[in-house]
C-alpha cells in the first residue's frame, strides 16, 4: 500500500509510536511494563498496568481482587474484567434483600403465591414475586385454565423470603405461612450429585496468551498484567477474581484480564445468600404443595411479592424451615415430595425449573 508509506514513515520518525500494518495507522508505544487497552493505543491513557488473573485494575491503578461468587446462593452475572470486578447476583429462584458492592449480602427465596392468588410479576434477582388475586370465579386449585395457566417452561415454587421484602404500592406483601414438615421431608430426599467441573485447581486463563504478553516491537499490547485469578480493575490494580471452589458452586463466567469470574449454584440449587459475583449460600430448590403456578418467566430476573388474597383464604405452604436453612445438596434428578399427604413423588429435572400444581402435573 504505497499510500500508507508516508504514515509509516512518520511513525518511524517518532520513537514513542510504531506503525501497525493490520490497522494501517500509527499507534502509541506503551512504556515498558504497561499494556494497551485497545489494539492500537493512541495516547498514554490507552496503556495500563497488568494484574494477575482474578484481579482487576482499579481507579487508583492498583490490582484489586474481583469478588467471589463462591457462596451457595450466588451466581456470576458479569465476569472479572481488566478494569472491573466480577459481579454476582442471587441465583435463580432468589432475590436480594441486602445488597453489597458488586454482589448481594443476603438472598431469599422468591415467595410462593398462596391459594387463591396468581403471580402478577415473577421474582427476579432483585425483587420478590408479586402476587395478585385470581380472577373472580377461579378456584384456589386453578380450575380455570385461562386464568391459572401451567407454564410450558415454567418455574418452581419458591419458599417465602424471611423477611419478605416491602410491597409495591399496587400489591401488599404477605408472608406465606404453614408447616415446614413438607419442606424438611422433601429436602431430606435430595441426594448429592457428583461434583461437576469447576475452576478449582486450574488456571482460569492462560497467563501466556495475548493480554498478558509484554509489549513486543511493533505491537500495541502494553497493558499492565495481573497474576492468574486476578483482573485489572478500573484504577489499574490487580484485584482478586472470586473463587467458585466450593462444592455447591459452578463457574458461570471465567476470570478475564479485566473482569472477575462469576459463580452460580450448581444445578438443582438456588442462592439463599448472595455475595459479589457469587453466592454465599446455596440451598436445594424448595418444593411446596403448590396450589399456585407462576407464569413462565426467568425467575432470576424478577421476584415475588403478594397482593392480598380474597377474604377467607389462607396461605398454606411454607417450603423451607423458618430459619431458611436447608441441606446443601443437589441431584441431577431429584425425587421430591409434592403434596402434604406424601401420596405422590415427582422427579424434577434440575436443568429447567418447573412449576407444580396440586395435581402433580
Amino acid at each position: 500500500f504505497p499510500q500508507d508509506r508516508p504514515f509509516e514513515d512518520t511513525c518511524h520518525g517518532n520513537p514513542s509510536h510504531y506503525y501497525d500494518k493490520a490497522v494501517r495507522r500509527c499507534c502509541y508505544r506503551c512504556p515498558m511494563g504497561l499494556f494497551p487497552t485497545q489494539q492500537c493505543p493512541q495516547r498514554p491513557t490507552d496503556c495500563r498496568k497488568q494484574c494477575e488473573p482474578d484481579y482487576y485494575l482499579d481507579e487508583a491503578d492498583r490490582c484489586t481482587a474481583c469478588v467471589t461468587c463462591s457462596r451457595d446462593d450466588l451466581v456470576e452475572k458479569t465476569p472479572c474484567a481488566w478494569n472491573s470486578s466480577r459481579v454476582c447476583e442471587c441465583r435463580p429462584g432468589m432475590f436480594c434483600s441486602t445488597s453489597a458492592v458488586n454482589s448481594c449480602a443476603r438472598c431469599f427465596f422468591h415467595s410462593v403465591c398462596p391459594a387463591g392468588m396468581i403471580v402478577k410479576f415473577p421474582g427476579t434477582a432483585q425483587k420478590n414475586t408479586v402476587c395478585e388475586p385470581a380472577s373472580p370465579g377461579v378456584s384456589p386449585a386453578c380450575a380455570s385454565p385461562e386464568n391459572c395457566k401451567e407454564p410450558s417452561s415454567g418455574t418452581i415454587p419458591q419458599a417465602k423470603p424471611t423477611p419478605v421484602s416491602p410491597a409495591t404500592s399496587s400489591a401488599s406483601t404477605m408472608p406465606v405461612r404453614g408447616g415446614t414438615r413438607l419442606a424438611q421431608e422433601a429436602a431430606s430426599k435430595l441426594t448429592r450429585a457428583p461434583d461437576s467441573p469447576s475452576s478449582v485447581g486450574r488456571p482460569s486463563s492462560d497467563p501466556g496468551l495475548s493480554p498478558t504478553q509484554p509489549c513486543p516491537e511493533g505491537s500495541g499490547d502494553c497493558r499492565k498484567q495481573c497474576e492468574p485469578d486476578y483482573y485489572l480493575d478500573e484504577a489499574g490494580r490487580c484485584t482478586a477474581c472470586v473463587s467458585c471452589s466450593r462444592d455447591d458452586l459452578v463457574e458461570k463466567t471465567p476470570c478475564a484480564w479485566n473482569s472477575s469470574r462469576t459463580c452460580e449454584c450448581r444445578p438443582g440449587m438456588i442462592c439463599a445468600t448472595s455475595a459479589t459475583n457469587s453466592c454465599a449460600r446455596c440451598v436445594p430448590y424448595p418444593i411446596c404443595a403448590a396450589e399456585t403456578v407462576t407464569k413462565p418467566q426467568d425467575m432470576a430476573e424478577k421476584d415475588t411479592t403478594f397482593e392480598a388474597p380474597p377474604l377467607g383464604t389462607q396461605p398454606d405452604c411454607n417450603p423451607t424451615p423458618e430459619n431458611g436453612e436447608a441441606p446443601a445438596s443437589t441431584s441431577p434428578t431429584q425425587s421430591l415430595l409434592v403434596d402434604s399427604q406424601a401420596s405422590k413423588t415427582l422427579p424434577i429435572p434440575t436443568s429447567a425449573p418447573v412449576a407444580l400444581s396440586s395435581t402433580g402435573k
Epitope: V101, T212, C238
Partner: antibody, heavy 120, light 107 residues
C-alpha cells in the same frame, strides 16, 4: 508436588548487591506468577512484588521499586531477585511464594527463605 | 496502601481451649483475607483464604470469619502443635499487605 527451593544465605557489605534464586519444581513454571516477600527478624511480612515468568512482566510494591529487580529463567524454571545498594535495613529473610490458581488466593507454596545479612 | 492491624501481639491459651485471633483492615477488603501460620524457623503456611475458605489439608479446628474490615481466625480446640505466629494478609489489592502477627503461646 510443588516445591520452591531457594539459594543459600548471603553475607554482603553495605552498598553491595546480592542476587538470590528460587528454583521451582512440580508444576509448569510459566503458569504461576512468582511473588517475593521480605521478613525482617522478629518483624512482619512485606510483599515486594511479582513476576510473570511466561512474559517477564513485573510489578513492584512502590517501597521496593528501586531496591529489588525480579527476573526469571524459563529454561531452568528459576526466578531471581537482585537487591541493590544494600543497607542494614535489607538484612532479612526473603521468600519466594506462589499461588494455586482457581483454588487459592493466598500464597499456597513458599520457598524455605534466603537469609541476607548486611554487615560492614 | 491497605494496613492490616493485629491488635494482640501475644495470646496465651491452654491445650483444648478455644481462641480467636483478630485482624482489622484500614478499609473494606471484601473478605479477601488470608491467614498464615508460621512456626519458628519455618516458612509461613497458608491456612485460610477468602476469609473463611480452608486451604487443602488444614485441620477443621481452624476457622476463618469476618467481612468488611474485621476478620478473625478461630482455633476451636488448641493443640500443642498450634504454637506459632499467625499473620493475616489482604489479598484484595496490590500491594498485598500483612498484619504484624499474633504469637500464640501455650500455657
Amino acid at each position: 508436588q510443588v516445591q520452591l527451593q531457594q539459594s543459600g544465605a548471603e553475607l554482603a557489605k553495605p552498598g553491595a548487591s546480592v542476587k538470590m534464586s528460587c528454583k521451582a519444581s512440580g508444576y509448569t513454571f510459566t503458569s504461576y506468577w512468582m511473588h517475593w516477600v521480605k521478613q525482617r527478624p522478629g518483624q512482619d511480612l512485606e510483599w515486594i512484588g511479582y513476576i510473570n515468568p511466561s512474559t517477564d512482566y513485573t510489578d513492584y510494591n512502590q517501597k521496593f521499586k528501586d531496591k529489588a529487580t525480579l527476573t526469571a529463567d524459563k529454561s531452568s524454571s528459576t526466578a531471581y531477585m537482585q537487591l541493590s545498594s544494600l543497607t542494614s535495613e535489607d538484612s532479612a529473610v526473603y521468600y519466594c511464594a506462589t499461588r494455586h490458581y482457581g483454588s487459592s488466593y493466598g500464597f499456597a507454596y513458599w520457598g524455605q527463605g534466603t537469609l541476607v545479612t548486611v554487615s560492614a | 496502601d491497605i494496613v492490616m492491624t493485629q491488635s494482640h501481639k501475644f495470646m496465651s491459651t491452654s491445650v483444648g481451649d478455644r481462641v480467636s485471633i483478630t485482624c482489622k483492615a484500614s478499609q473494606d477488603v471484601s473478605t479477601a483475607v488470608a491467614w498464615y501460620q508460621q512456626k519458628p524457623g519455618q516458612s509461613p503456611k497458608l491456612l485460610i483464604y477468602w476469609a473463611s475458605t480452608r486451604h487443602t489439608g488444614v485441620p477443621d479446628r481452624f476457622t476463618g470469619s469476618g467481612s468488611g474490615t474485621d476478620y478473625s481466625l478461630t482455633i476451636s480446640s488448641v493443640q500443642a502443635e498450634d504454637l506459632a505466629v499467625y499473620y493475616c494478609q489482604q489479598h484484595y489489592r496490590t500491594p498485598f499487605t500483612f498484619g504484624s502477627g499474633t504469637k500464640l503461646e501455650i500455657k
